[in-house]
Each structure stands twice: as C-alpha cells, then as structure tokens.
C-alpha cells in the first residue's frame, strides 16, 4: 500500500487522491472528470530532445 | 442491474471472528477502477467505514480497525469477505457492502449498497 | 481523521418549503478544482441510497428537488420543495483521505 507522497506514481500513472491509488491515466480520454487525471500530461513526451532553443 | 447482498452469522460470542461475505452481480471486480467497501451502523447510530478492495487486490483499512481487519475477494465468484477479529460487544451492527466504480465521466461513487447483515455479539 | 460534523442533528420542514442541511469538515476535503463531498439519504430498515456525488453532481434518478453546494470545509444539502417522501436521515460522506468518514446525520421530519 502507498501512501501519498511517499512514492511517486509510476510513468503513465497519478496519484488519485479520491481512491487514494496511483491510477492509469490512459483512461482519462473516457473518463476525464477523473481526479488523477490533473496530473496527468495532456501531451505524450516529445519522441527527442531538441538540440536547439 | 447492479446488486450486493450481505451475509454473516447472525449472532456470535464474544472474542470470535466474525466473517462476512458480499455476493454481488451486473458489474466485475476484474475492471479497472472498480472496488467494494464494507461500511457498519450500529442500530440507531451512524456510519463508519471499515475497509476497500480494489479490482487489482489492492486493500485499504480503515486504522481504528486496521488490526483485526482483512478483506479478500474471490473475483470468479463475485464475492467480496471480511475478518474481524476478536469482537466484542460493540461489533454488534448492521453491516453493509457498497461498490465504489467510474461512473460515464469517471466520479467514483459508492453508488450501490447492499441490504445489509444483522450481527449481534453476545455472550 | 477527517470530522464531519452536521447540523441540525434534526428538523422538521412543513411539505413545500426548503429543507437546508450543512456539514462542516474539520479539515478541507477540497482541492483548486475537486470537492470529494458526497451526500447519501437512508430511510428506516434500507441502506443509504446516494444522492448527490463530489459536492453537486446529482446521482441518475435523483429527482431535482435535491441540491447540493459548497468547497473547502462547508457544505450544504438543499431540498426544495420538500416532499413526503423525504422525510429520512441524511449523511454527507468525504472521499478526500483515508479514512473516508461520514457525518453524524440529519434526520428530517415532514410536518
């Protein structure tokens, strides 16, 4: 069990202070009124990192 | 149609383990996000949460109680349980079983309960 | 533990007129831009049926006479007009930590 704040979430996953759980948040697109889905990225990382400003 | 139905001994001494057993159907303990809380009332009096289990088998417990408590579930047959350990009289409610899923736009509601299983501990 | 304390513990609303229930938190159960307060009715021998979920989101089936407001550490059920069929016990329950608490309960007369 997870308390909160003492582990991140892993990648792709937020903390849910509602179910007190890290959740998946790749069912944020159906369900967004979700609470967990604050934390998570509305963009997917970018695939590289730019090399210029 | 969503259903829970609750059941136990009825009555039991003292210092036993009271085991419960939440029966349910119309949803899946197997889909993301979907879990069942076990919740008391004694008669006359209010609500107190007991303990959660989520679709993954992860478990929540309410501290007051948290050791005497264990929920477990067998997901093939719908059916959420609960110990209590070494009861007393003061363990003598009414307790209920109460799904906690996403709704359409993803609140998560204790939305539907059981009737409820009487439990008197007397000696 | 999250207290929730509500007021009255009772009270007696003539058929038609506004029923108003507050439950106070003893700690926000609020964020910027989430409520985890939710409100459940239970009338003699049933379970608690809900009625309202995350302060103002009435459950399906939940007729609009029931309303719900507030943030932070106040909340407020509102019934209006107030039916016949109201008259029950209500509980506001938080989701915001654990333990997830309930309050007291209201128990509401029809005159």
């Known amino acids: 069990e997870q308390a909160p704040g003492t582990a991140p979430c892993s990648h792709g996953s937020s903390w849910s202070a509602d179910l007190d759980k890290c959740m998946d948040c790749a069912s944020c697109r159906a369900r967004p009124h979700s609470d967990f889905c604050l934390g998570c990225s509305a963009a997917p990382p970018a695939p590289f990192r730019l090399l210029w400003p | 149609q969503v259903s829970l139905k609750e059941s136990g001994p009825g009555i039991l001494q003292p210092s036993q383990t009271l085991s419960l057993t939440c029966s349910f159907s119309?949803?899946?303990?197997?889909?993301?996000?979907?879990?069942v809380s076990w919740i008391r009332q004694p008669s006359g009096k209010g609500l107190e949460w007991l303990a959660h289990?989520?679709?993954?088998?992860?478990?929540r417990y309410n501290p007051s109680l948290k050791s005497r408590l264990t929920i477990s579930k067998d997901t093939s047959r719908n059916q959420v349980f609960l110990k209590i350990t070494s009861v007393d009289t003061a363990d003598t409610a009414t307790y209920y079983c109460a799904r906690r899923g996403p709704d359409y736009y993803g609140y998560y509601p204790m939305d539907y309960w059981g009737q409820g299983t009487s439990v008197t501990v007397s000696s | 533990d999250i207290v929730l304390t509500q007021s009255p513990a009772s009270l007696a609303v003539s058929l038609g007129q506004r029923a108003t229930i507050s439950c106070r938190a003893s700690k926000s159960v609020s964020t910027s831009s989430y409520s985890y307060m939710h409100w459940y009715q239970q009338k003699p021998g049933q379970p608690p049926k809900l009625l309202i979920k995350y302060t103002s989101n009435l459950e399906s089936g939940v007729p609009a006479r029931f309303s719900g407001s507030g943030s932070g550490t106040d909340f407020i059920l509102n019934i209006h007009p107030v039916e016949e069929e109201d008259a029950a016990t209500y509980y506001c329950q938080h989701s915001r930590e654990l333990p997830w608490t309930f309050g007291g309960g209201t128990k509401l007369e029809i005159k």
């Open positions: 119309g949803f899946s303990l197997s889909t993301s996000g979907m879990g």
């Open positions: 289990i989520y679709w993954d088998d992860d478990k």
